[in-house]
Amino acid sequence: QQQTLPKPFIWAEPHFMVPKEKQVTICCQGNYGAVEYQLHFEGSLFAVDRPKPPERINKVQFYIPDMNSRMAGQYSCIYRVGELWSEPSNLLDLVVTEMYDTPTLSVHPGPEVISGEKVTFYCRLDTATSMFLLLKEGRSSHVQRGYGKVQAEFPLGPVTTAHRGTYRCFGSYNNHAWSFPSEPVKLLVTGDIENTSLAPEDPTFPADTWGTYLLTTETGLQKDHALWDHTAQNLLR
């Protein structure tokens, strides 16, 4: 006999990286007929929703109007059908950004390289942080972590055309509080025609959309719950 219901999906809209003082909605999707959803923050109850009518609703939304460092952290949700509770969702890491300062991102030997060349990104921030994050914009929101007193280096090794794209970095004051994003650096990798066609550049957004940190395609990560859970869970681990 089943003792628990399947775990719900949890995600953040528009994104799990939220500029301070901006709003975010945490979504929890369970099953039709669920009479109660609970949102937990760092292991403690944060909010409760009892949707009406439960048989017509399978997703609830928990609104956070003003993101700050106290709201940043790990969230999970559960739901109940009758007296039976679900397994907890995967953890959602909600990150507050635009804290304190702006790092500088540079690339060596330069932003235009030939396929096979070794490339290293450098992220520098002169305030008290020792963890840095390098993000490549696009569908898959590639994230790398680096460490250093005021600067971290991110060696990409011999690059291919798949490394083409726009990069930014953040300084991290803790796992869930990040700096302003650096200015973008666009890496151009030239290679032979065959390689280029096999490794198209990730789709990216115009610079003015970065402010909302939508690092995904419109039909991509936000709606792909399994991938979203995976990305949110592994981003900082």
């Epitope: 709003q23 403690s44 944060f46 909010a47 409760v48 929703d49 009892r50 609830v60 609104y63 709201m71």
Partner: nanobody
Framework: EVQLVESGGGLVQPGGSLRLSCAVS????????MGWFRQAPGKGLEFVAA????????YYADSVKGRFTISRDNSKNTAYLQMNSLRAEDTAVYYC???????????????????????WGQGTLVTVSS
């Protein structure tokens, strides 16, 4: 400027009743989830009860379930906490609180964490003693 003003506290004997009120001004009260918290002498802040903006969802701490009732009157911009069967351990300063932000809250959601609330009253003292 947002103002939350609690009233109704006082001295009451064990087993007695009190009704706390929380009048809200300066915000669109009718679309904001509300909550009551308390702080006993020498203790931390404790969640008591919460209510959704539509009144369709209420939620209580286990310690007050069945004895306390939270309600609201959106036409009067006021939230209430009816406290029955009071015990000595209910002695505390009671605070009402309103969430921040605009009008985007679900009609059925309540918040139980103090960190979710942006605006707080000054508190009203409830003393349960014989």
């Amino acid at each position: 400027e947002v103002q939350l003003v609690e009233s109704g506290g006082g001295l009451v004997q064990p087993g007695g009743s009190l009704r706390l009120s929380c009048a809200v001004s300066g915000r669109t009260f009718s679309r904001l989830p509300m909550g009551w918290f308390r702080q006993a002498p020498g203790k931390g802040l404790e969640f008591v009860a919460a209510i959704s903006w539509s009144s369709s969802t209420t939620y209580y701490a286990d310690s007050v379930k069945g004895r306390f009732t939270i309600s609201r009157d959106n036409s009067k911009n006021t939230a209430y906490l009816q406290m029955n069967s009071l015990r000595a351990e209910d002695t505390a300063v009671y605070y009402c609180a309103a969430v921040g932000g605009s009008l985007d809250y679900s009609a059925t959601v309540v918040y139980t964490a103090a960190r979710a609330y942006a605006d707080w009253g000054q508190g009203t003292l409830v003393t349960v003693s014989s």
